[in-house]
């Protein structure tokens, strides 16, 4: 055979993204000439793995190989055989991996050990597992999305083609929702960032750029809703909690062990006279807003002005992209279209929630029950979070774009990582020549 | 012209331990991942393990019979492939091939001509 | 791991002879089977890979075919230097594994 066949001029890319519900595969390709170039790279196929994320196989890592198969083949299907030796692959897990740390670093080892001999048996240029901070998932997700729009990009051949078109460099804050983090990434206008866990410096293209970032972990949708179920347990005078964040004749039984199992839970955990309670749905949007407002604790604040939880929040500024879960919920409710304003969306909240269960069922038939049942939940929840929580307002919804792809890739963390992993974001501006390795950021 | 050429085989007690040497040449070395294939006598061919690059963090991986007792590993700077061989058993005694790919992968298309190990009290 | 299995283990045939050899794989491995060819004393030759393709110097009467779990290796015109070994090998995922091997002899 012949010497190595002269590869392709286009390279590839692979980022798994372990969330804390599920694991997505991402594959993204560009042309080997242009690394440097803003924009080129673009995502040709995601693969969602059947089951939930890699946390849960805490008990069962023997599994994960498994698991793990179905899309790894995808991959070596889409990507051509010659390339394979030369693509990295990456894995990222999130805050449901976080979240197993804080209850046991071993634990936590023993599966990420487990993924990376598992990943590390492809052909494949396995490059890493790893937990990813918070911060990180909040300032990737911010790459993703800016880099998708071009605002990092001086040319402007972009400004036709990319939707959202605002014809500055200005970029977009990113309000990134999971399961078990919610992420709230932007450039605050002129604002000192008063706390230094939360500031970030990036120069990237020739341009200095001061950012904000914050993660709060426990405050992704599931998780939340944990929460929730954890303090309104607290006060319920039986093994009963009617719920009105669960649509009318809805019922459920929850083990109380399982409720206790998170550590999102623990501030809220009492020995309680049974070991199981039922939901039954009554279906009220303002109850249901006002219980999730006390996950939030606003009494205090060391700073200027917060978010909740004493956590510092400049003033927002500019147009922001909600993405993952934010776009998903949303775009279930049909409530992403630019053109719906805040008190629309409450109202549709409001009707939506108040929908009998076998009404909603029937409805949406094709959708599971344990998805379609939390709707009303999430809903509610992104309004509160992003009303009562982040502070925006009536007026300033509008500048909330609910994104879930930008020119065909997934707005999410996954490509920012790759792109700072595999020295594709240049901190000056690209000249005819390709930078040496040294100037990147 | 490409050529792996093995040495290090010999006569050795159960238990014992030896370690081969393949070198190459005729190939950029550190470019390929390279692979141990062994032939027990009038046996069929059977995988020893493989070693990637450099970029791949030199790493490994073994068929279940030799894993814990067989640890390969490449110098680069040499264009040298080495087997470490401990606690060897008699059913170890084989004929130990240094192969590669050249095109793609998982497949040997560059053989050395083998060197026999012999396991015997 | 794949477990490659090729029959039949011997097979004697004339010179000029078409001859098909067999290998089966006891999963799915795609077009990831490779064929060896080996002569006493000698290092195994590929000659064939990806389950079809032809490998440069290796004569045009040697032909591969298959995919999933089946496979066969067919010489179209035996030659009396085509008598040897001939080994599959599973090039989908480690380990890697070779089959048992078809010994051509001379009828």
């Known amino acids: 055979t012949q010497n190595k066949a002269l590869p392709e001029n286009v390279k590839y890319g692979i980022v798994l993204d372990a969330g804390s519900s599920h694991t997505s595969l991402y594959i993204y390709k560009w042309p080997a000439e242009k690394e440097n170039d803003t924009g080129v790279v673009h995502q040709v196929e995601e693969c969602r793995v059947k089951g939930p994320g890699i946390s849960k196989f805490v008990q069962k890592v023997n599994e994960i190989g498994i698991y793990l198969t179905d899309c790894m083949e995808r991959a070596r299907e889409v990507i051509p055989r010659s390339q394979h030796q030369e693509t990295p692959v990456y894995l990222g897990a999130t805050a449901g991996m976080r979240l197993l740390r804080m209850e046991s670093e071993e634990l936590a080892d023993r599966v990420l050990d487990v993924v990376e001999r598992s990943l590390s048996n492809y052909p494949f240029d396995f490059q890493g597992a790893r937990i990813i901070t918070g911060q990180e998932e909040g300032a990737y997700g911010w790459i993703t999305i800016n880099y998708l729009l071009g605002k990092f990009s001086q040319k402007t051949r972009w400004f036709s083609i990319v939707p959202y078109e605002t014809n500055n460099q200005e970029t977009f804050g990113a309000l990134d929702l999971g399961g078990a983090s919610t992420q709230v990434t932007f450039v605050p206008q002129n604002q000192t960032i008063e706390s230094p866990d939360n500031a970030l410096q990036f120069r990237l293209y020739g341009k200095d750029y001061n950012v904000y970032t914050h993660s709060f972990l426990c405050y992704g949708k599931d998780q939340a809703l944990w929460q929730k179920l954890a303090k309104d347990i607290q006060v319920a005078s039986n093994e009963i909690l009617r719920d009105p964040c669960f649509h009318p004749g809805y019922k459920k039984v929850v083990n109380v062990s399982d409720l206790y199992k998170t550590p999102c839970t623990k501030r809220f955990e009492m020995t309680l006279p049974f070991q199981q309670f039922e939901i039954q749905g009554i279906g009220n949007y303002q109850q249901c807003h006002q219980s999730i407002l006390e996950l939030f604790n606003t009494s205090y604040c060391p700073y200027s002005q917060c978010a909740f939880n004493g956590i510092f929040l400049p003033p927002l500024q500019g147009d922001f992209g909600a993405f993952s879960a934010f776009y998903f919920v949303m775009k279930f409710l049909n409530l992403t279209s630019e053109k719906v304003s805040q008190e629309k969306v409450t109202e549709m909240m409001k009707k939506f929630c108040a929908q009998p269960w076998e009404e909603i069922k029937t409805s949406y038939a094709g959708v599971k029950e344990k998805y379609l049942s939390e709707y009303c939940f999430s809903g509610t929840y992104i309004l509160s979070l992003l009303l009562q929580g982040y502070h925006f307002t009536a007026d300033s919804w509008e500048h909330i774009h609910f994104i879930g792809k930008i020119q065909g890739s997934d707005a999410g963390w996954t490509l920012g990582y790759m792109l700072n992993l595999t020295n594709m974001i240049p901190a000056e501006q690209p000249l005819s020549t390709p930078l040496s390795h040294s100037t990147y950021v | 012209e490409v050529q792996l050429v093995e040495s290090g085989g010999g006569l050795v007690k159960p238990g014992g331990s030896l370690r081969l040497s393949c070198a190459a040449s005729g190939f950029t070395f550190s470019k390929y991942w390279m692979n141990w294939v062994r032939q027990s006598p009038g046996k069929g061919l059977e995988w020893v393990g493989e070693i990637r690059l450099k970029s791949n963090k030199y790493g490994t991986h073994y068929a279940e019979s030799v894993k814990g007792r067989f640890t390969i590993s490449r110098d680069d700077s040499k264009n040298t492939l080495y087997l470490q061989m401990n606690s060897l058993k008699t059913e170890d005694t084989a004929v130990y091939y240094c192969?590669?790919?050249?095109?793609?992968?998982?497949?040997?298309?560059?053989w050395g001509q083998g060197t026999t190990v012999t396991v015997s009290s | 791991e794949i477990v490659m299995t090729q029959s039949p283990a011997t097979l004697s045939v004339s010179p000029g002879e078409r001859v098909t050899l067999s290998c089966r794989a006891s999963?799915?491995?795609?077009?990831?089977l490779h064929w060896y060819q080996q002569k006493p004393g000698q290092s195994p030759r590929l000659l064939i890979y990806y389950a079809s393709q032809s490998i440069s110097g290796i004569p045009a009467r040697f032909s591969g075919s298959g995919s999933g779990t089946d496979f066969t290796l067919t010489i179209s015109s035996v030659e009396p230097e085509d008598f040897a070994v001939y080994f599959c090998q599973n090039g989908h995922s480690l380990p890697l594994t070779f089959g048992g091997g078809t010994k051509l002899e001379i009828k």
């Open positions: 192969t590669t790919q050249l095109d793609l992968y998982w497949f040997f298309d560059v």
């Open positions: 999963q799915s491995i795609s077009d990831y």
